[in-house]
């Protein structure tokens, strides 16, 4: 059994959330991947997907979100840019494999956002040549939407959790629907 | 409670060879990605090398290419660094670190092994 | 290979003052910088994480800020357990991962 743990990031709005989701090459690297939201008594949302399959380097932005699988390296990059209140939550990265369920990939990410804005002199958090370098360019394909064998009738749990796992990766009960937001210009 | 705990450290002449090992508990150890940090004496921290969780990617500074190998046995939770054509510039405290589940810091440390590559 | 230096090398504070420290790197790493705390004959123990955020079990009185390139830890209120040498570290990407030299804090 697999504890199913969070790690907290406390950032301020308009701060950028930027982690590292770290999965077995040999197995995923070219698999679509996925950056969702668990929200209380929901199943999880997808809020943006790599494309399928998925592409080296290539940055995919829906909205906010900046997704950038690093296949020689087995890490997707997720970068939440211009952060809001409303963000905070509990996030995961997934990959999809159909016909399977996803799998999840350590760890969940607890986004916590206040108010205010503490950078110090000469920070470029906020700049918008900083944020807005990546083109942007969202995914050619909608997110898949998978329906789970089972069903879901609780939420997802806030701390920790047994769950069985294949190497690395948690293996899902359920999927999603997709949110998609107008990406910058 | 995350602990891990090195050993193998010791005397090795310039040119030898030592094998370091870390064992890991208390986490799910083939979900984390493990490192090696060394320190000289009264020097600073030197990231050494990184392996990712199910160990299909692996990490080196410069200053150990090709000398260091690093690999790991989930089946034992166990972590090990072989180190080849030892240096006196390797003598340091080697410690075993638990990388976090989300970027590349270390969130758990051993307590180190000393390293002495001296004639 | 990003560059972190700290300054000062050492800092002299009396108990109860506060301590600032500070950590630049060569480049812009966004908010990928770690902090930590090391005493004599100790492994280092990690205090904070994603410039921000304090790691668990870490006492309020330390904190972090900045992004880009400048980083300070801040240390409110200095106990008698605080003194010891403090690290930064980023993790923007790819390795390798660098630490900056270290600031030692000493009692005044």
């Known amino acids: 059994a697999t504890k199913l743990t969070e790690e907290k990031y406390e950032l301020k709005e308009g701060q950028t959330l930027d982690v590292k989701c770290d999965y077995t090459l040999e197995k995923f690297a070219s698999s679509q991947k996925a950056w969702q939201i668990i929200r209380d008594g929901e199943m999880p949302k997808t809020l943006a997907c790599t494309e399928r399959p998925s592409k080296n380097s290539h940055p995919v932005q829906v909205g906010r979100i900046i997704l950038e699988d690093y296949h020689d390296h087995g890490l997707l990059r997720v970068r939440m840019v211009n952060l809001q209140v409303e963000d905070s939550g509990l996030y995961q990265c997934v990959i999809y494999q159909p016909p399977k369920e996803p799998h999840m990939l350590f760890d969940r990410i607890r986004l916590v956002v206040t108010k205010g804005f503490s950078g110090t002199p000469g920070s470029n958090e906020n700049s918008t040549q900083n944020v807005y370098k990546i083109p942007p360019t969202t995914t050619k394909a909608l997110c898949p939407l998978y329906t789970s064998p089972r069903t879901v009738t609780q939420a997802p749990p806030k701390s920790t959790a047994d769950v069985s796992t294949p190497d690395s990766e948690i293996n899902l009960t359920n999927v999603t629907d997709i949110i998609r937001v107008p990406v910058f210009n | 409670e995350v602990q891990v705990l090195e050993s193998g450290g010791g005397l090795v002449q310039p040119g030898g060879s030592l094998r370091l090992s870390c064992a890991a508990s208390g986490f799910t150890f083939n979900a984390y990605a493990m490192s090696w940090v060394r320190q000289a004496p009264g020097k600073g921290l030197e990231w050494v090398s990184t392996?990712?969780?199910?160990?299909?990617?692996?990490y080196y500074a410069d200053s150990v290419k090709g000398r260091f190998t690093i690999s790991r046995d989930n089946s034992k939770n166990t972590l090990d660094l072989q180190m080849n054509s030892l240096r006196a510039a390797d003598t340091a405290v080697y410690y075993c670190?638990?990388?976090?589940?989300?970027?590349?810091?270390?969130?758990?440390w051993g307590q180190g092994t000393l390293v002495t590559v001296s004639s | 290979e990003i560059v972190m230096t700290q300054s000062p090398a050492t800092l002299s504070v009396s108990p109860g003052e506060r301590a600032t420290l500070s950590c630049r790197a060569s480049q812009s790493i966004n908010s990928n910088l770690a902090w930590y705390q090391q005493k004599p004959g100790q492994a280092p123990r990690l205090l904070i994480y994603?410039?921000?955020t304090r790691a668990t079990g870490i006492p309020d009185r330390f904190s972090g800020s900045g992004s880009g390139t400048e980083f300070t830890l801040t240390i409110s209120s200095l106990q008698s357990e605080d003194f010891a040498v403090y690290y930064c570290q980023e993790f923007i990407m790819f390795p390798p991962w660098t630490f900056g030299q270290g600031t030692k804090v000493e009692i005044k």
């Open positions: 392996i990712s969780g199910s160990g299909s990617t692996t």
């Open positions: 994603g410039a921000y």
């Open positions: 670190a638990k990388v976090a589940g989300s970027n590349f810091f270390f969130d758990h």
